[in-house]
């Protein structure tokens, strides 16, 4: 049973721990955080690039996705790979760079304020929209037609933060991803010691809002490393 606090990102203090059922990460996940590649910074130049192990796209940077480095490679070995630019082949939205989505196997541009009707062979799917509100019925459209794009509100399922309304981010919540509030000053935040170390979290908090950074709370400096409380503070 997990005694993790399921932070709603909407309160200044942590709620009492809420009981939870056990989460069982797959082998790729449980192995990944234990693997430490030498060399450090994954944002160094390509010559010094160190692959970062991952299990899911959200463990990688915003310009990356999680996949096997070799085509048809071992599914158990996945690393963060650079996102695919426009007109490149893709299998899912996260493979495409921000501002694009995967349509019929190709990364295409998405409009921030509207989304294009997504045509597949016999169905239409709306991408970038709040995915709980997808129609269950076929809606044939032309590529040039536009539909009004409603941004996801708090608690809505999302694929990436651009799916969410202003002031919200798309964060892991158990086996799904939902829109959660960006953290305000004084709210508890998660400071990852290294990129991707949140891989085993069953839920994620959003990042701190504009002008704020996630830092150790002043009165917690003396606490042990493991119990230090981080909060969003002014720069």
């Amino acid at each position: 049973t997990l005694n993790s606090v399921l932070n709603s990102n909407a309160i200044k203090n942590l709620p009492p721990p809420l009981g939870g059922a056990a989460g069982h990460p797959g082998s790729a996940v449980s192995a990944a955080p234990g693997i430490l590649y030498p060399g450090g910074n994954k944002y160094q130049t390509i010559d010094n690039y160190q692959p970062y192990p991952c299990a899911e796209d959200e463990e990688c940077g915003t310009d990356e996705y999680c996949a096997s480095p070799t085509r048809g490679g071992d599914a158990g070995v996945q690393i963060c790979l650079a996102c695919r630019k426009r007109r490149k082949r893709c299998m899912r939205h996260a493979m495409c760079c921000p501002g694009n989505y995967c349509k019929n196997g190709i990364c295409v541009s998405s409009d921030q304020n509207h989304f294009r009707g997504e045509i597949e062979e016999t169905i239409t799917e709306s991408f970038g929209n709040d995915h709980s509100t997808l129609d269950g019925y076929s809606r044939r459209t032309t590529l040039s037609s536009k539909m009004y794009h409603t941004k996801g509100q708090e608690g809505s399922v999302c694929l990436r933060s651009s799916d969410c309304a202003s002031g919200l981010c798309c964060a892991r919540h158990f086996w799904s991803k939902i829109c959660k509030p960006v953290l305000k000053e004084g709210q508890v935040c998660t400071k990852h010691r290294r990129k991707g170390s949140h891989g085993l979290e069953i839920f994620q908090r959003c990042y701190c809002g504009e002008g704020l950074s996630c830092r150790i709370q002043k009165d917690h400096h003396q606490a042990s490393n493991s119990s230090r409380l981080h909060t969003c503070q002014r720069h």
Epitope: L18, G23, M91, S176
Partner: antibody, heavy 115, light 108 residues
Framework: QVQLVESGGGLVQPGGSLRLSCAAS????????MTWVRQAPGKGLEWVSG????????YYADSVKGRFTISRDNSKNTLYLQMNSLRAEDTAVYYC????????WGQGTLVTVSS | DIVLTQSPATLSLSPGERATLSCRAS???????LAWYQQKPGQAPRLLIY???NRATGVPARFSGSGSGTDFTLTISSLEPEDFAVYYC?????????FGQGTKVEIK
Amino acid sequence: QVQLVESGGGLVQPGGSLRLSCAASGFTFNNYGMTWVRQAPGKGLEWVSGISGSGSYTYYADSVKGRFTISRDNSKNTLYLQMNSLRAEDTAVYYCARTIYMDYWGQGTLVTVSS
Amino acid sequence: DIVLTQSPATLSLSPGERATLSCRASQNLFSPYLAWYQQKPGQAPRLLIYGASNRATGVPARFSGSGSGTDFTLTISSLEPEDFAVYYCQQYLSLPTTFGQGTKVEIK
């Protein structure tokens, strides 16, 4: 349109096993977490298990932990629930559904555990 | 576990009347991580509301959700014949995600 079709239900003796399948279509399967929910005859809804889009993260209700295994094959757009050591209290209609709040549901498949 | 208690257990109303269904959580949800479903006999449930107040696609405007903290409400402004069914609430803040026991809306 989005469609979820369960199969694999049936009559099984206590202690027996069954594997349920849920064939998904009409959406990009690997973008979504999937959920199994069950409903005993004349009763309410009970969450059973959930799995993330890539299959890396799985979650179980205490009542089925250690007996049931959720999995998915994204290349086949199919969700599975392997049920072992079945008990009479596992008798229910099993539904597969999309995401943590269930925006689309299958029609359900009946699992009866009885001797 | 978070327990959701729905009331009343049964609501007897006539078409055209307003229905107010309550869902109370045993702990403060802090966030609007609550959904409502409708289920008719022999059918799978259908999502009506998510995020406490967002209507799912295809759900008529007569259905609305509200509330926060521990108290949530589903309102059907004017009952249509097809609205007579069982309604469930679900919280997805913490695991296990739990459902209320249901409220049956029946024809008076």
